[in-house]
C-alpha cells in the first residue's frame, strides 16, 4: 500500500526493454519507489556500450526516473584471442561471436599440437569457454622429438648430419669460446652449466644459432638469451656434478622441420638407457683430426656401465667422481665419442613408445684424449633434473 | 566515500613498458560498474583507453589494441594498466574512473622521455 | 569512431548569466552522452549522464538535454565558481570518445 506523499508527481509507468522484464510490476510509482531490470539469459544490461551487472531506477520528486532505461543486448564475446602459431576459425558463421556461438582453435600442423579439443562457445558470462569451462584460450604447444635422423650411423668417429636429424642442436657462441645446447621448449634452451658458467652473469653477450648444419653457415635463427640459469648444486672448477643449466631465450623461436625441441624423458625413459643401449650424441667439436668441426657431426654411442667408468676415471683422474648424476657412452676399444666444442649438447634416445627422441644426457666432461680405448664421455643424467627443469620453466 | 587512487612511475623510456594500478576503496569493483583508464595530453585532449567491467571482460580503444591491457586483481580491489612500447605520444595525464564518470582518481602525470 | 565537435572552444559569460554549451555526434548516439567540468589542475567531475540525467551532488543550475546527435550543457546563473573546461562524451559505441573541451571564462 502506497502513501502518496506531498508534492510529488508519480512516475511513468516503466516499460521493459526488449530481451528484459521489470520488477516490481506495481499499478503506480510515486516518490522513493523502485524498479529492477533483468535480462533474459545471453543478455546483458548496457547503457550505450557499457555494461551493468545490475540496474535500479528510482523515482524521484518531480516524477521522473533517476536514470533511464538500459537495454537487454544480446552477450558479445568479442573477436577471440589470436592463438600464436594457430588460427581460428568461426562455425556458427563469419565473424559471429554473440551469445552460443561456437569457434574452433587449431594449431599449425606437424610443428603444434594442443592439449584441448580447441571447441569454444560464447556463454552467459561473456567469455569463449572450452567445454572443460576453460576461459583462457589454447595453447599451441611445440612438437617435440621428431627427427629424420634412423640409428645406423657408424665428433670423433662420426658422420655427417643431414638437414632435419637434429632439429633441437644449438649452436652457443661466445667471443672466444663455442658451446651446444639443445632446445626444450620453443623459448628454454638446455646446455652444461660448465659451457655458460662465464656468462652468467653476462647473458646477453652469449650469441645463440639454431636451425644449421655448418657452423658458420650464414642462413641461421638467431636467437638472444633473456636469462641463464645455472643448477645451484654446480661448482665451477670443483667436479663436474649438476653441470646442467637452463638458458631461457628473450622471444620464442618458430618450429618448423630444422628447428624443434627434443622431448624430456618420460619416467619411463630410464629403462631406455640402460647400459649397452644406444644414444646420439651430435656438435661442432673437435673431429678425430682434432679440428672442430665445419658440419654437424654425430656418433651414434652405447651407454656404458656406471661402475666400469667410475673406475676407470679413479684410476685416470684421482678426486674426479663420476656421480649418480651422471651416465657414461662409448666404445671399450674408443674411436666413438663426444669432444671438446661438444660441450652441452643432447645425448638423445629413440622413445620407441612415442617415436620420439628424448634427451638422456648433456655433454658434459671426460678424458683429454676423446674417444681413447676405456674412457668414456660423462654426459649429464638428465632424467635426474626433471623437477628442476620443470621448476625453473613454470617459475620463470 | 569510494575512492579511486592511480600509482606508477613518473618517468617512463622510450620502447618500454609502462604499468599502473589503480586502487578502489569503498566499493567492490566486482560489485559493478565498468572500471575505466582514461588520459589526458598536454593541451587538455582526452582519450579513453578501454575498460575491465564488473565481471573482468575488457574493451579496448581498437587505437591502442596491439599495446594496452587491463587486468585486475580482485583480492586487493585493484585494476591495472599496461602499455608496451611508449613513445615520447604517450606523455600524458592518466586517470583511472569507473562508468557514470561519477569517480575519478586524480591522476597520475606520465612523461616518456629518455 | 564517433567524433564529438565542441565548435566553441572558449566562451565568455558574467556570474549571473545563462549560457549553453553544445556538442554534436558524428552520428545518432541516442542518449548515451555524458557531460564532465574540469577546473585547472583537477581531475574531469561528472555533471551530467544519460544526456539530462544530473549526477549526484550537482546543482540543479547545470541541466542536460538533447538526443540523436546535438547535445547541450546549460548553466543557468553562472557562478565564479564555474570557472572550468567542460567536455562532452558519448558511451554509445566502443571506443567511447570525447569532445576537445569548451573552457568558460567569467568576465
Known amino acids: 500500500h502506497h502513501h502518496h506523499h506531498h508534492a510529488s508527481r508519480p512516475c511513468p509507468d516503466p516499460t521493459a526493454p526488449p530481451n528484459g522484464s521489470i520488477s516490481p510490476v506495481q499499478a503506480i510509482y510515486v516518490l522513493k519507489d523502485r524498479f529492477s531490470v533483468f535480462c533474459k539469459t545471453g543478455f546483458e544490461l548496457l547503457q550505450g556500450s557499457v555494461p551493468l551487472k545490475s540496474f535500479t531506477a528510482v523515482c524521484q520528486k518531480d516524477g521522473s526516473w533517476d536514470r533511464p532505461m538500459p537495454e537487454c543486448s544480446i552477450i558479445d564475446c568479442g573477436p577471440p584471442d589470436d592463438l600464436p602459431n594457430g588460427h581460428v576459425d568461426y562455425i556458427t558463421g563469419p565473424e559471429v561471436t554473440t551469445y552460443k556461438a561456437v569457434i574452433q582453435y587449431s594449431c599449425e600442423e606437424t610443428f603444434y599440437t594442443m592439449s584441448s579439443n580447441g571447441k569454444y562457445v560464447c556463454e552467459a558470462d561473456g567469455f569463449w569457454t572450452s567445454s572443460k569451462g576453460e576461459k583462457l584460450p589454447p595453447v599451441c604447444e611445440p612438437v617435440c622429438g621428431l627427427s629424420t635422423h634412423t640409428i645406423g650411423g657408424r665428433i670423433v668417429g662420426g658422420q655427417p648430419a643431414k638437414p632435419g636429424d637434429f632439429p633441437w642442436q644449438v649452436l652457443l657462441l661466445g667471443q672466444t669460446t663455442a658451446a651446444a645446447g639443445a632446445l626444450i621448449h620453443d623459448n628454454w634452451v638446455l646446455t652444461a652449466a660448465h659451457a655458460v658458467y662465464e656468462k652468467r652473469m653476462a647473458a646477453s653477450s652469449l650469441n645463440i644459432r639454431m636451425g644449421i648444419l655448418k657452423r658458420l653457415s650464414p642462413h641461421y635463427t638467431q636467437a638472444w638469451p633473456e636469462e641463464i640459469f645455472i643448477h645451484e648444486g654446480y661448482t665451477h672448477g670443483a667436479g663436474f656434478d649438476n653441470d646442467i643449466a637452463l638458458i631461457k631465450l628473450k622471444n620464442k623461436v618458430t618450429i618448423n622441420g630444422s628447428i624443434m625441441p627434443v622431448c624430456l624423458p618420460r619416467k619411463e625413459a630410464a629403462s631406455l638407457m640402460r647400459t649397452d643401449f644406444t644414444g646420439t650424441v651430435a656438435g661442432w667439436g673437435l673431429t678425430q683430426k682434432g679440428l672442430l668441426a665445419r658440419n654437424l657431426m654425430f656418433v651414434d654411442i652405447p651407454i656404458a656401465d656406471h661402475q666400469k667408468c667410475t673406475a676407470v676415471y679413479e684410476k685416470l683422474y684421482p678426486g674426479v667422481r663420476v656421480s649418480a648424476n651422471m651416465l657414461c657412452a662409448g666404445l671399450e676399444t674408443g674411436g666413438k665419442d663426444s669432444c671438446r666444442g661438444d660441450a652441452g649438447g643432447a645425448l638423445v634416445f629413440l622413445d620407441n613408445e612415442t617415436q620420439r627422441w628424448f634427451v638422456g644426457g648433456i655433454v658434459s666432461w671426460g678424458s683429454i684424449n676423446c674417444g681413447a680405448a676405456d674412457q668414456y664421455g660423462v654426459y649429464t643424467k638428465v632424467i635426474n633434473y626433471i623437477p628442476w627443469i620443470e621448476n625453473i620453466i613454470s617459475n620463470f | 566515500q569510494m575512492q579511486l587512487q592511480e600509482s606508477g612511475p613518473g618517468l617512463v623510456k622510450p620502447s618500454q613498458s609502462l604499468s599502473l594500478t589503480c586502487t578502489v576503496t569503498g566499493y567492490s569493483i566486482t560489485s559493478d560498474y565498468a572500471w575505466n583508464w582514461i588520459r589526458q595530453f598536454p593541451g587538455n585532449k582526452l582519450e579513453w583507453m578501454g575498460y575491465?567491467?564488473?565481471?573482468?571482460?575488457?574493451s579496448y580503444n581498437p587505437s591502442l589494441k596491439s599495446r594496452i591491457s587491463i587486468t585486475r586483481d580482485t583480492s586487493k580491489n585493484q585494476f591495472f594498466l599496461q602499455l608496451n612500447s611508449v613513445t615520447t605520444e604517450d606523455t600524458a595525464t592518466y586517470y583511472c574512473?569507473?562508468?557514470?564518470?561519477?569517480?575519478w582518481g586524480q591522476g597520475t602525470t606520465l612523461t616518456v622521455s629518455s | 569512431d564517433i567524433v564529438m565537435t565542441q565548435s566553441q572552444k572558449l566562451m565568455s559569460t558574467s556570474v549571473g548569466d545563462r549560457v549553453s554549451v553544445t556538442c554534436k555526434a558524428s552520428q545518432n548516439v541516442g542518449t548515451n552522452v555524458a557531460w564532465y567540468q574540469q577546473k585547472p589542475g583537477q581531475s574531469p567531475k561528472a555533471l551530467i549522464y544519460?544526456?539530462?540525467y544530473r549526477n549526484s551532488g550537482v546543482p540543479d543550475r547545470f541541466t542536460g538535454s538533447g538526443s540523436g546527435t546535438d547535445f547541450t550543457l546549460t548553466i543557468s546563473n553562472v557562478q565564479s565558481e564555474d570557472l572550468a573546461e567542460y567536455f562532452c562524451q558519448q558511451f554509445n559505441t566502443n571506443p567511447l570518445t570525447f569532445g576537445s573541451g569548451t573552457k568558460l571564462e567569467i568576465k
Open positions: 544519460s544526456a539530462s
Open positions: 575491465i567491467s564488473y565481471s573482468g571482460r575488457t
Open positions: 574512473a569507473r562508468h557514470y564518470g561519477d569517480y
